[in-house]
């Protein structure tokens, strides 16, 4: 679809005569008839196959024709066509004299013709005007012409319809050849596909408008290249969605069980050595001079009762000093000047002579110790209770009072809340520091797996093309993580790879 445009510029008829040679009275009131038709080697009369147009009276005898596209498109003259422009044409321009106001062919005498010109040739579509001048014996006509495409038609022959658009069926303008030129940020055959944010992950991200990156289920981050770990994952990471791979020192389904209390919490004070002894349990080995579960208590050097035989201990800056009772001497009052005759053994201890009566030794009854059986036995000095248990002297024996979650003579055993099989429907029991946790089989939930729920959405293997299936525990649905080259909620559609 296009328009043949003819711009009349000047007509010269100085003598004001008709084609017959007869003069016009009072002058030649001139109008034009134009016939556009298919190419003919010799232009002959006949149907104007491409169209016709007539002008009103434009002047008398000789005159210039003004541009007048405002008044209904009078000059240039418009000859629209609704077909593919063939590239060739024939053009007939007739100048007529109008004696009256009726310009219809049937209303004019045949001899009212002033001049007739006919041209033919090739004409390509374009914006440039071709200037031409045709001269006869008595007249001269100067004009120019061109063929342009109608609005929304493009190409060498105006055959390609293209309408710019900016909606969801395309975001483009039209090139001179009628091909689409995508607006910035759009691609695809019809410029309907947005170009996502640069770097947006090909499989895990998508967009509905340019420079956007929306994440598919299980992925997050500006470029949708970070997986979302299992809901509730505390000290863990993922490489594919809904995983929970524990960081070093952590365990359990949600990586919330501390397997390295020593490193994470550094509970042992004053340079003590920390040893992990189970989940959230540890033992501190104190340096000399310190005591307590966390070696937080500084020992006085006298706390170890270094003075024997009833000697009293005095702390000094550089150590301690023993004040010995009568009959004893030495750094620790360990040497005696007494003999069995002096009844040196206390608390029912029996005395035995040594070295021909120059010395003695006391044999102590149970619960007493010391050179003279003067000390009550403290069975707790060796700190025998593990896991922070408190040691209690009980006559001839000792007893450990254990912290919650521990048992055994020395609190060395972790109390198993799982012993009574509290998890229903075949759930797996995990001991925690303050209780237990049940891992339920597919189809059950609740603290003790007592609630029947829907079966694992991945159990039916819904994902195709070796995609990985993940169950979204929050919605009981599955998510397929597609391998490269496949899309769709089940990865069932292959993508045409470049």
């Amino acid at each position: 679809s296009g328009v043949f445009q003819l711009q009349l510029q000047e007509f010269i008829n100085e003598r004001g005569v008709l084609a017959s040679g007869r003069p016009c009275e009072p002058g030649c009131r001139t109008f034009f008839r134009v016939c556009l038709k298919h190419f003919q080697a010799v232009v002959s009369p006949g149907p104007c196959t491409f169209g016709t147009v007539s002008t009103p009276v434009l002047g008398t005898n000789s005159f210039a024709v003004r541009d007048d596209s405002s008044g209904g498109g009078r000059n240039p003259l418009q000859l629209p066509f609704n077909f593919t422009w063939p590239g060739t044409f024939s053009l007939i321009i007739e100048a007529w004299h109008a004696p009256g106001d009726d310009l219809r062919p049937e209303a004019l005498p045949p001899d009212a013709l002033i001049s007739k010109i006919a041209i033919q040739g090739s004409l390509a579509v374009g914006q440039n005007w071709l200037l031409d001048e045709q001269t006869s014996t008595l007249t001269r006509l100067r004009y120019s012409y061109r063929v342009i495409c109608s609005d929304n038609y493009y190409g060498d022959n105006c055959s390609r319809l293209c309408k710019k658009r900016n909606d969801h069926f395309g975001h483009y303008v039209c090139q001179p050849d009628g091909n689409l030129s995508c607006l910035p940020g759009w691609t695809g055959e019809y410029c309907q596909q947005p170009i996502c944010l640069s770097g947006c992950h090909e499989q895990n991200g998508y967009c509905s408008k340019p420079a956007e990156c929306l994440c598919r289920p299980g992925w997050q981050g500006r470029l949708c290249n970070e997986c979302i770990p299992h809901n509730g994952c505390r000290h863990g990471t993922c490489s594919t969605p809904w995983q929970c791979t524990c960081d070093e020192g952590w365990g359990g389904l949600f990586c919330d069980q501390d397997l390295n209390y020593c490193t994470h919490h550094s509970p042992c004070k004053n340079g003590a050595t920390c040893s992990n002894s189970g989940q959230r349990s540890y033992t501190c080995t104190c340096r000399p001079g310190y005591t307590g579960v966390d070696c937080e208590l500084e020992l006085s050097e006298c706390d170890s009762n270094p003075c024997r035989n009833g000697g009293s201990c005095k702390d000094q800056e550089d150590g301690y000093h023993c004040l010995c009772p009568p009959g004893y001497y030495g750094l620790h009052c360990e040497h005696s000047t007494l003999s069995c005759a002096d009844s040196p053994c206390f608390n029912g201890g029996s005395c035995r002579e040594r070295n021909q009566g120059a010395n003695y030794a006391c044999e102590c009854p149970p619960n007493f110790t010391g050179s003279n059986c003067e000390k009550k036995v403290d069975r707790c000095t060796s700190n025998p209770c593990a896991n922070g248990g408190q040691c209690l002297n009980r006559g001839p024996s000792r007893m450990c009072r254990c912290r919650p979650g521990f048992t055994g003579t020395y609190c060395e055993l972790h109390v198993s809340d799982c012993a009574r099989n509290p998890c229903a429907h075949g759930g797996t029991c995990h001991d925690l520091e303050n209780g237990l946790m049940c891992t339920c089989p597919a189809g059950f939930s609740g603290r003790r797996c007592e609630v029947r729920t829907s079966i694992d959405a991945c159990a039916s293997s819904p994902c195709f093309n070796r995609a990985t299936c993940y169950t979204d525990l929050s919605t009981d649905t599955f998510v397929c993580n597609c391998p490269y080259g496949f899309v769709g909620s089940r990865c069932e559609f292959p993508v045409g790879l470049p």
């Epitope: 609005d151 929304n152 658009r165």
Partner: antibody, heavy 121, light 107 residues
Framework: EVQLLESGGGLVQPGGSLRLSCAVS??????????WGWIRQAPGKGLEWIGD???????YYNPSLKSRVTISVDTSKNTFYLQMNSLRAEDTAVYYC?????????????WGQGTLVTVSS | EYVLTQSPGTLSLSPGERATLSCSGQ??????ASWYQQKPGQSPRLVIY???KRPSGIPDRFSGSNSGDDATLTISRLEPEDFAVFYC?????????FGQGTKVEIK
């Protein structure tokens, strides 16, 4: 040949909601060449475009209905859906699903047979 | 809100006659117009898309044009099966818009 089949129509109370399905057979809903649309026609009246969806999930709605309408797609089921809330008597219509072709400037070259939704107490 | 107005509302013609249906909208010529035929109790059927193109299976007696503010559907010689309601449709930004329809009935 591609065929579209609507389901889910029937009688709905005023203020209620509807969920219609359009199952596509004979072709993939995941084709990049089509949008999938919903159009309705009240008894004795003309056609009214409701909205459409691309296989990626991008949606477009008639502004006059946007607040009450949601269109979604399940590529695994080759089906798309129309959810419409706060229904009133004037929503009574035959609801059609249609395929809108990019190669046809958005013209709807395939239509379902329609499903009647009646809103009445 | 973009509006498409079809005229006439009803066209009474005899088989063999020429039918000319009009659809008007502001600068409609800058948009692609589609035409649909709907018979009673049936779904609409696309007969013209992108102003003047016919889908496969549509006879060549159906033709279309679109320029300025008007799109036209022409049926050169009406056949008995052509009598129906015809709707024009165009896209305004991201919204589909239909005309109110023209009924072509047997005279």
């Amino acid at each position: 040949e591609v065929q579209l089949l609507e389901s889910g129509g029937g009688l709905v109370q005023p203020g209620g909601s509807l969920r219609l399905s359009c199952a596509v057979s004979g072709g993939s809903i995941s084709s990049s060449s089509y949008y999938w649309g919903w159009i309705r026609q009240a008894p004795g009246k003309g056609l009214e475009w409701i909205g459409d969806i691309y296989y990626t999930g991008s949606t477009y709605y008639n502004p006059s209905l946007k607040s009450r309408v949601t269109i979604s797609v399940d590529t695994s089921k080759n089906t798309f859906y129309l959810q419409m809330n706060s229904l009133r008597a004037e929503d009574t219509a035959v609801y059609y699903c249609a395929r809108q072709a990019l190669a046809m400037g958005g013209g709807s070259d395939k239509w379902g047979q329609g499903t009647l939704v009646t809103v009445s107490s | 809100e973009y509006v498409l107005t079809q005229s006439p509302g009803t066209l009474s013609l005899s088989p063999g006659e020429r039918a000319t249906l009009s659809c008007s909208g502001q600068r409609l010529g800058d948009k692609y117009a589609s035409w649909y035929q709907q018979k009673p109790g049936q779904s609409p059927r696309l007969v013209i898309y992108e102003d003047s193109k016919r889908p496969s299976g549509i006879p060549d007696r159906f033709s279309g044009s679109n320029s300025g503010d008007d799109a036209t559907l022409t049926i050169s010689r009406l056949e008995p099966e052509d009598f129906a309601v015809f709707y024009c449709q165009a896209w305004d930004r991201d919204t589909g818009v239909f005309g109110q329809g023209t009924k072509v009935e047997i005279k």
